[in-house]
């Protein structure tokens, strides 16, 4: 049985203000049981970007259908990009816990930066 890997293929993503950015994340296993969340930054001050289970994230949509069985694609789209969105984004697998889920493995991160505005 292979150990779970979190794959974020892009190290750097250049985005344009006002456009939509796609952050890719795939996993190699359904196990261990537990959710995948997206964060910007690391450590205790990191910002939660998307949690399907709870919270309101009006600018974030999932690339895969939320009703897809045994989904291993946890990519997201962030719309209406602003300069405040720059930073490094991590998809993070949590192991199901009771009562609290426990962080299990993080992807390597994708740095989102502003690209030159097309002329």
């Amino acid at each position: 049985e292979e150990e779970l890997q979190m794959i974020q293929p892009e190290k750097l993503l250049l985005v344009t203000v006002g456009k939509t950015a796609t952050l890719h994340c795939t996993v190699t296993s359904l196990l261990p049981v537990g959710p995948v969340l997206w964060f910007r930054g690391v450590g205790p001050g990191r910002e939660l970007i998307y949690n399907q289970k709870e919270g309101h994230f009006p600018r974030v949509t999932t690339v895969s259908d939320l009703t897809k069985r045994n989904n291993m694609d946890f990519s997201i789209r962030i719309s209406s990009i602003t300069p405040a969105d720059v930073g490094t984004y991590y998809c993070v697998k949590f192991r199901k816990g009771s009562p609290e889920n426990v962080e299990f493995k993080s992807g390597p991160g994708t740095e989102m930066a502003l690209g030159a505005k097309p002329s």
């Epitope: 049985e1 296993s29 359904l30 196990l31 261990p32 049981v33 537990g34 959710p35 995948v36 399907q52 289970k53 999932t62 939320l66 009703t67 897809k68 069985r69 045994n70 989904n71 946890f74 192991r95 199901k96 009771s98």
Partner: antibody, heavy 120, light 108 residues
Framework: EVQLLESGGGVVQPGGSLRLSCAAS????????MTWVRQAPGEGLEWVST??????YYADSVKGRFTISRDNSKNTLYLQMNSLRAEDTAVYYC???????????????WGLGTLVTVSS | EIVLTQSPATLSVSPGERATFSCRAS??????LAWYQQRPGQAPRLLIY???IRETGIPERFSGSGSGTEFTLTITSLQSEDFAVYYC??????????FGGGTKVEIK
């Protein structure tokens, strides 16, 4: 075709032990969480335990008495039941988990069940 | 623990008629709800997941609806093989996974 076949049920005295097995075929066993669900005679369904890879989860009613495990090389799920009580009398079903909506599991295939009777 | 309450406990329906029964959750489970059918002497069978998606091979006469705390399973034009017990199950917040107490659909 997915198949789940439970075995190991029987009659046991209160305080006794039993080990249930569930032989799985027709899918990549090691890739999926697996679950035990039980049904007391004439009653509804009660979740007992779930195992992922190394992660295990138990209903409060069996915690500390039952142990779920798996042998991926044998495609087999187990439930070790100790300190059995009369209220553990039930048909025990093994079920394959399926995941949807980024987390959360339901059970898409079930075995036929094995009856455990705890009685003196 | 999320409690699921199914109603009615028993539903008497004539073959060919429509059957509708409900599952109410004690707190919001979004769409994380499944429905199972259990015929006498058999194991449960998955019918619906994500509140409304029919499992492969399940006839179109079975449909699920609802979200949040109120869910409904509808069987249009009941066939003889549909007389069984139906259970809902939530997978939004676990452990524990919880099931409703079941609705028995019997021949009128």
């Amino acid at each position: 075709e997915v198949q789940l076949l439970e075995s190991g049920g029987g009659v046991v005295q209160p305080g006794g032990s039993l080990r249930l097995s569930c032989a799985a075929s027709g899918f990549s066993f090691s890739n999926f969480a697996m679950t035990w669900v039980r049904q007391a005679p004439g009653e509804g369904l009660e979740w007992v335990s779930t195992i992922g890879s190394g992660d295990t989860y138990y209903a409060d009613s069996v915690k500390g008495r039952f142990t779920i495990s798996r042998d991926n090389s044998k495609n087999t799920l187990y439930l070790q039941m100790n300190s059995l009580r009369a209220e553990d009398t039930a048909v025990y079903y093994c079920a394959k988990d399926s995941t949807v909506s980024w987390s959360g599991d339901f059970f898409d295939y079930w075995g036929l069940g094995t009856l455990v009777t705890v009685s003196s | 623990e999320i409690v699921l309450t199914q109603s009615p406990a028993t539903l008497s329906v004539s073959p060919g008629e429509r059957a509708t029964f409900s599952c109410r959750a004690s707190q919001n489970v979004k769409n994380d709800l499944a429905w199972y059918q259990q015929r006498p002497g058999q194991a449960p069978r998955l019918l619906i997941y994500a509140a409304r998606i029919r499992e492969t091979g399940i006839p179109e006469r079975f449909s699920g609806s609802g979200s949040g705390t109120e869910f409904t399973l509808t069987i249009t034009s009941l066939q003889s093989e549909d007389f069984a017990v139906y259970y809902c199950q939530q997978y939004y917040d676990w452990p524990p996974f919880t099931f409703g107490g079941g609705t028995k659909v019997e021949i009128k």
